[in-house]
């Protein structure tokens, strides 16, 4: 039902869903800190623009007794319960921040008349693509898929002279929320990735993965998986790996690879790590002091959600436009705003664009080095290291099918 919004007469409220089920196991206190830091910045920016208005956040907590799994499995109902709570209290803000679980976002979007914008730190799945009033501030699965297809097809780089058309995907069902949806998108038979590949098989058992590493009859040299180096080690250990195997390890929200003292373990030499370009530095901010590098992106997305709202509010107020309109609800896309850590670009569908970075392990220095970057906004790859010190023969990535000549 239609809920009146606390969103006029110089007072603008943000409804923040504080859900027990979350894409990342981040204490809600840290997310509150991120939101509050964002509010301080927004208030300052509005004041500097001569706009004398009040901006606040209302944190809506769900009943932890009912929804207490902590992960996203029971989030579908939790999201709707929170919306019901908002409805009963007649306390809807101008914008809804949260949820982060794909299940809950999809269901909430489906079951409500969304005449207000919804900003999510998560909602990675393909089912949340192309939603008119949903903005996602962490890289969704679609962006990953487009990178992989672009990279597979690339054959004119000094270190990649073959197009690839095959892959194994390792997916055992224990993945984190982001990985679950990334791999789900690669697995889906109707997805862009599946459509563009000639051969793709999902490996679901540890043994299947381990057998492929030395199987002379394997159908592809390329294996995609998602997680951190420790996850790979648990699976691979110190097993021998055929010299033309390439493991692509998707680990987007982990900037530890860029830290000065990090040395790549030996088991990473056959691995290309796909991660996001690190932030300029969040280390000095009050909200990020308690965060691990892997959690920074999640809290930052909450903070940036507040800054995005402030950006849109400023534009609409300066233009004398009403905030409680479909126009406002549909405006959170195809724009660049000043995020906490620099400019943030949203595509035509409200999804964040970013620079993805593909790293390799230098056999000389045992350090992670940047091989190439990929700009999701323009779907373009930029080589960074033209003569990488790879483990692979001739310092070039092998063909994806053993024994097949140049493509």
């Amino acid at each position: 039902s239609q809920v009146s919004q606390n969103c006029h007469n110089g007072s603008y409220e943000i409804s923040v869903l504080m859900m027990g089920n979350s894409a990342f196991a981040e204490p809600l206190k840290n997310l509150e800190d991120a939101v509050n830091e964002g509010l301080e910045i927004v208030r300052g920016r509005l004041q500097n623009a001569g706009l004398n208005v009040t901006v606040n956040a209302t944190f809506m907590y769900s009943d932890g007794l009912i929804h207490n799994s902590g992960d996203c499995r029971s989030s579908t109902c939790e999201g709707l319960d929170l919306l019901r709570k908002i409805s009963n209290a007649q306390r809807m803000g101008c914008v809804l921040i949260g949820p982060s679980c794909t299940y809950s976002t999809f269901q909430m979007y489906l079951d409500t008349e969304l005449s207000y914008p919804m900003i999510s730190a998560g909602s990675f799945g393909l089912s949340c693509d192309y939603k008119e009033t949903l903005t996602r501030l962490m890289s969704p699965a679609r962006k990953l898929m487009y990178f992989l297809v672009n990279f597979w097809k690339t054959n004119d780089l000094p270190f990649k002279t073959y197009s690839w058309s095959t892959s194994y995907v390792y997916k055992n069902g224990t993945e984190t929320e982001d990985c679950f949806w990334y791999l789900n998108a690669l697995e889906a038979s109707v997805s862009y990735f599946s459509h563009e590949l000639g051969f793709k098989v999902v490996l679901r058992q540890d043994k299947e993965f381990q057998d492929i590493l030395m199987d002379h009859n394997r159908k592809s040299n390329v294996i995609i998986m998602c997680g951190g180096p420790e996850f790979l080690y648990k699976l691979k250990g110190d097993r021998a790996v055929a010299e033309d195997i390439v493991i692509i390890l998707v680990d987007l929200f982990n900037d530890q690879y860029f830290e000065d003292n990090v040395t790549a373990p030996d088991y990473m030499k056959n691995v290309l790590v796909l991660t996001l370009s690190p932030g300029n530095s969040l280390l000095n901010s009050s909200f990020s002091r308690n965060l691990s590098p892997t959690k920074r992106d999640f809290a930052l997305a909450y903070l940036n959600g507040i800054l995005l709202f402030g950006h849109m509010l400023k534009i609409f107020l300066e233009n004398g436009e009403n905030i409680t309109t479909p126009k406002f609800a549909h405006a959170f896309r195809n724009l660049t705003f000043e995020g906490y850590d620099g400019p943030v670009t949203l595509d035509d569908w409200g999804d964040v664009d970013s620079t993805m970075v593909l790293l390799y392990t230098s056999v000389d220095t045992k350090k992670y080095k940047v091989l190439l970057t990929y700009d999701t906004h323009v779907n373009k790859t930029y080589p960074v290291d033209m003569s990488p010190t790879f483990t692979w023969k001739n310092s070039k990535l092998p063909n994806d099918i053993t024994g097949r000549g140049p493509q």
């Epitope: 004119d156 860029f258 690190p278």
Partner: antibody
Framework: EVQLVQSGAEVKKPGSSVKVSCKAS????????ISWVRQAPGQGLEWMGG????????NYAQKFQGRVTITADKSTSTAYMELSSLRSEDTAVYYC??????????WGQGTTVTVSS | DIVMTQSPATLSVSPGEGATLSCRAS??????LAWYQQKPGRAPRLLIY???TRATGIPARFSGSGSGTEFTLTISSLQSEDFAVYYC????????FGGGTKLEIK
Amino acid sequence: EVQLVQSGAEVKKPGSSVKVSCKASGGTFSSYAISWVRQAPGQGLEWMGGIIPIFGTANYAQKFQGRVTITADKSTSTAYMELSSLRSEDTAVYYCARGHYYYMDVWGQGTTVTVSS
Amino acid sequence: DIVMTQSPATLSVSPGEGATLSCRASQSVSSNLAWYQQKPGRAPRLLIYGASTRATGIPARFSGSGSGTEFTLTISSLQSEDFAVYYCQQYNNWPTFGGGTKLEIK
């Protein structure tokens, strides 16, 4: 509008080292490549190496490998190029240039380095 | 290294006329080619990247074409400020520059 301001001219003895700085102002520093290009008197342009400050590690042209070190300080938006074991043929104008990877859209004013005994 | 060869070394043209500068790569560089203009005592200035895309603020009389190994910079109607040295540069591999073409007033 991004500007790159380089340190002043240097006169060096053969065998010594020189360190040239390049300070960026008015735009994004960290996520662009900063390249160093030199030009000997009356000659063409020669790429020495580059760094993307946000990633930290530099890449070098084969010819300069082991003799050049490129670094960047994100906190001051400054890149540095140090060339060691100088010889007379290193006499040149040294430019820093900001690029979208390896084409260069903004250039510093150049720093003249003279190597002479 | 990829060797870039520019021709001619010197080109004499009258103001108002057009000029065509050539650049050849020793192996394919796809469309990863840039053109620069340099005047005496000044830093180079980016004109074209991606073989044919004009950089910000570059007049429409400058155009680039080609891909693979053969590239051309065309200046349609020469102004007095266009007389300078022009360099091509590939960035398909570690960057290398051509030797330059000096465009002088006839």
